[in-house]
């Protein structure tokens, strides 16, 4: 149960994560204009991953699409590389994912599949989550660079008399969604690659013992018992000398630290 | 088509207060910025504020904070401008105006006439 | 504030006759973000409102004749009128539609000789 549980909780919150790289991918919010200790302008800007924005104080909004990719700052590029690896290699997990999933049955797929592909899954999905936050974490850094730059030569201007006032950017309400849709992504992933382990075939913990019957001679090998898929009880596979004989099902219906993840 | 009505002529007393109103027809009136600028007689220009009447949200400018006080009523698609504690000073042409592209004011009320004297 | 710098004060000007009026900031109202000068032109007649002429420096509002140009960048815009008609006798006004407070020059007046 408890398996099941850390597999569809792992799925949900993978799920709720690559939404969010998405959406953060798509927001125009990256960066926003710095509004602390500026002049009080009738407009506002903010810049996102493929469009930058102006909303002028009459409400009208304005956005203006980068349709050069040569012209675009190499940081800028690998920030979308980053994402949209990361919306990828997620997706693909959770198609793996749906079908690794404990609770749904397709065909006679055996649990050692399930968990190979629970496996992948979670694996993708890390390294979906990491992608996003490096990402984010790259474009942040940007911002910051940026931000003192432009904060030291903040004015120009002819001997003090016309100034010019860059505009400064901070961080934009993307960013916070990106870093907390990666780190969602990220523990999906690693509540899938623990239950992953919850799923793998068990080794037995007794030693091949021969049988000599009549005729010919038969070796039972251990490991050969195949994990329950969860539907209906498998009271033919017992667990030898775990310290009684226990069904897999009340196996799973014990707590685990599983339960609480 | 786009109309800012505005209120009558006022003859005001010093120290008195006059609210005068800036009625919108002919467009949505929560969509818009509703600016109000002074005229003095013969004399340039000068910005006081502004109201949202989306949400009641102002903006004025330091010189004309707690002389004035914008208000709005979504109801009536109606503006208001108060002034209190009027002087001389205080005597000129009040005018609305609605915002848009490029943050200009592109329809401006008729104006409003306010003259203070004892 | 804002500082809006209008010259010259005033403009003689015969019917035909071409004329450029000027309007300086202390700032650049220039924003980078849409590459857009925040600048407006009004012209306003005795006993009347201000009218919108241009926004955005260049962009004339609809039912602006053509022959009211607005031109410039960063601090320094100019108003042109290629030919003056008589109708075009009024002040003209520029304002900085970039930082709050909003702020407007002192005008222009376009005079008949």
């Known amino acids: 149960m408890a398996v099941t549980a850390c597999q569809g909780l792992g799925f949900v919150v993978s799920l709720i994560g690559i939404a969010g790289i998405i959406a953060a991918t798509c927001m125009d919010q990256w960066s926003t204009q710095d509004l602390y200790n500026n002049p009080v302008t009738a407009v506002f800007n903010y810049q996102g991953l493929w469009r930058s924005c102006v909303r002028e104080s009459s409400g009208f909004t304005e956005c203006r699409g980068y349709f050069t990719l040569l012209g675009l700052p190499a940081m800028l590029q690998a920030v979308r590389a980053l994402m949209i690896v990361g919306i990828v290699l997620g997706a693909i997990g959770l198609l793996v994912s749906i079908f690794a999933l404990k609770c749904i049955r397709i065909g006679s797929m055996e649990d050692s599949a399930k968990a190979n592909m629970t496996l992948t899954s979670g694996i993708m999905f890390i390294v979906s989550g990491l992608c996003a936050i490096a990402g984010v974490s790259v474009f942040a850094n940007m911002l910051v660079t940026n931000f003192w730059m432009s904060t030291a030569n903040m004015y120009t201007g002819m001997g003090g008399m016309v100034q010019t006032v860059q505009t400064r950017y901070t961080f934009g309400a993307a960013l916070f969604v990106g870093w907390v849709a990666g780190g969602l992504t990220l523990i999906g992933g690693v509540m899938m690659c623990i239950a992953c382990r919850g799923l793998a075939p068990e080794e037995t913990n007794y030693k091949a013992v021969s049988y000599h019957a009549s005729g010919h001679s038969v070796a039972y090998k251990p490991g050969g018992f195949k994990a329950s898929t969860g539907f209906g009880s498998n009271t033919k596979n017992k667990k030898i000398y775990d310290g009684g004989a226990r069904t897999e099902d009340e196996v799973q219906s014990y707590p685990s630290k599983h339960d609480y993840v | 088509e786009v109309q800012l009505q505005q209120s009558g002529p006022e003859l005001v007393k010093p120290g008195a207060s006059v609210k005068m109103s800036c009625k919108a027809s002919?467009?949505?009136?929560?969509?818009?910025?509703m600016h109000w600028v002074k005229q003095k007689p013969g004399q340039g220009l000068e910005w006081i504020g502004y109201i949202n009447p989306y949400n009641d949200g102002t903006k004025y400018s330091e010189k004309f904070k707690g002389k004035a006080t914008l208000t709005s009523d979504k109801s009536s698609s109606t503006a208001f401008m108060e002034l209190s504690s009027l002087t001389s000073d205080d005597s000129a042409v009040y005018y609305c105006a609605r915002l848009d592209y490029g943050n200009a004011m592109d329809y401006w009320g008729q104006g409003t006439s306010v003259t203070v004297s004892s | 504030d804002i500082v809006m710098t209008q010259s010259p004060s005033s403009l003689t000007v015969t019917a035909g006759e071409r004329v450029t009026m000027r309007c300086r900031s202390t700032?650049?109202?220039?924003?980078?973000?849409?590459?857009?000068?925040?600048l407006t032109w009004y012209q306003q007649k005795p006993g009347q409102p201000p009218k919108l002429l241009i926004y955005w420096a260049s962009t004339r509002e609809s039912g602006v004749p053509d022959r009211f140009t607005g031109g410039g960048s960063g601090t320094d815009f100019t108003l042109t009128i290629s030919s003056v008609q008589a109708e075009d006798l009024a002040v003209y006004y520029c304002q900085n539609a970039y930082y709050y407070p909003l702020t407007f020059g002192a005008g222009t007046k376009l005079e008949r000789k």
């Open positions: 700032q650049s109202l220039f924003n980078s973000g849409n590459q857009k000068n925040y």
């Open positions: 002919g467009y949505t009136f929560t969509g818009f910025l």
